[in-house]
Interface confidence: low
Amino acid sequence: SAGAGSHCQKTSLRVNFEDIGWDSWIIAPKEYEAYECKGGCFFPLADDVTPTKHAIVQTLVHLKFPTKVGKACCVPTKLSPISVLYKDDMGVPTLKYHYEGMSVAECGCR
Amino acid sequence: SAGAGSHCQKTSLRVNFEDIGWDSWIIAPKEYEAYECKGGCFFPLADDVTPTKHAIVQTLVHLKFPTKVGKACCVPTKLSPISVLYKDDMGVPTLKYHYEGMSVAECGCR
């Protein structure tokens, strides 16, 4: 798995809803693949981490003043939905096909 | 300035183009306010860091398994342009009013 020494990339993160206390309202699935963005944003920033101009600037400033300015951060840049069966406000089981923003589609340096 | 112990926020970051080697093609300004996003994404994530669902989930998983899963990261979520006078490919000084993505407008937890 990607650690701090490796470049920014998408890694597996299985999330169990019971672990985060969401099993009280999410009926299914019991767990899902959320993914996590892990790794460093090292100079030079590669195209596959889709750096913004600000991220490029910050990376260059970090090279010059590493104790003063941090590196850019490896974060989700695109998210995808999952399907969930949840209890609505009335406790009625409701299926949401696209519960947005729950799983990482792409990581990048920001 | 905001450190790791403080909450995610926008802090000042003055960038001198000479420091990053961009003075070879950017004529003016000599420096600009890029800002930097600094601070931690601590539970509970406040509305002002506009967390995605994934960031909320990751924060909760981090609470449960802090050594396995990292916190969400404080990054620019909205960028703004600056105006620059630069040398084009022919070396001709050219004014670009909106050189996009150079300065942080907002920070958030992702």
Epitope: A28, I82, L95, S103 | -
Partner: antibody, heavy 119, light 107 residues
Framework: QVQLLESGGGLVQPGGSLRLSCAAS????????MSWVRQAPGKGLEWVSI???????HYADSVKGRFTISRDNSKNTLYLQMNSLRAEDTAVYYC?????????????WGQGTLVTVSS | DIQMTQSPSSLSASVGDRVTITCRAS??????LNWYQQKPGKAPKLLIY???NLQSGVPSRFSGSGSGTDFTLTISSLQPEDFATYYC?????????FGQGTKVEIK
Amino acid sequence: QVQLLESGGGLVQPGGSLRLSCAASGFTFSSYAMSWVRQAPGKGLEWVSITLGTGHTHYADSVKGRFTISRDNSKNTLYLQMNSLRAEDTAVYYCARGSYIIWSALDYWGQGTLVTVSS
Amino acid sequence: DIQMTQSPSSLSASVGDRVTITCRASQDIRSYLNWYQQKPGKAPKLLIYDASNLQSGVPSRFSGSGSGTDFTLTISSLQPEDFATYYCQQSDTSPLTFGQGTKVEIK
């Protein structure tokens, strides 16, 4: 133990109709998604339809508008009403249980029932 | 719809061999990939669910790995009863789709 038993297969002419049944036992039927999967002679598996524990239904494009999946939770029975049958619908039809209430792995399967569409 | 592509479509192996079958999804299916074994005239049997979880009662020589778009089923030491056809299937979303199958034959 979990058991699924299909019935209703047989020989039918093109354009005809057939209704398959799947009797389930050994588990709380209403809490699981149930699917129909078919296999043409000498071919691979093709998913046909699903009814979620919520009552939502989905179909493969190849059967949409012709087949209807339904369930009777009081009778622990799954159905597949097949209309406007075509020669390419000839297959062994399996009833399978999803491992939970929405789409998931198919953890238990019936023995299958053969549907032959021929004139 | 999500397309599932298995490779190889068939393979010949001997008892004791290590066998690997791959499955590729046309788009990200996270870890929602399942593997089935089918013997002639029989119903399919679930081996692995959610990419890497061994179904109860399945021998530990079967294992699965992968996430996203690329997945692998491995049989660490092929046994006589393992000669069969293997299918992958995605359960990320409807319509559920199967791979075309991999037939494991005796060499």
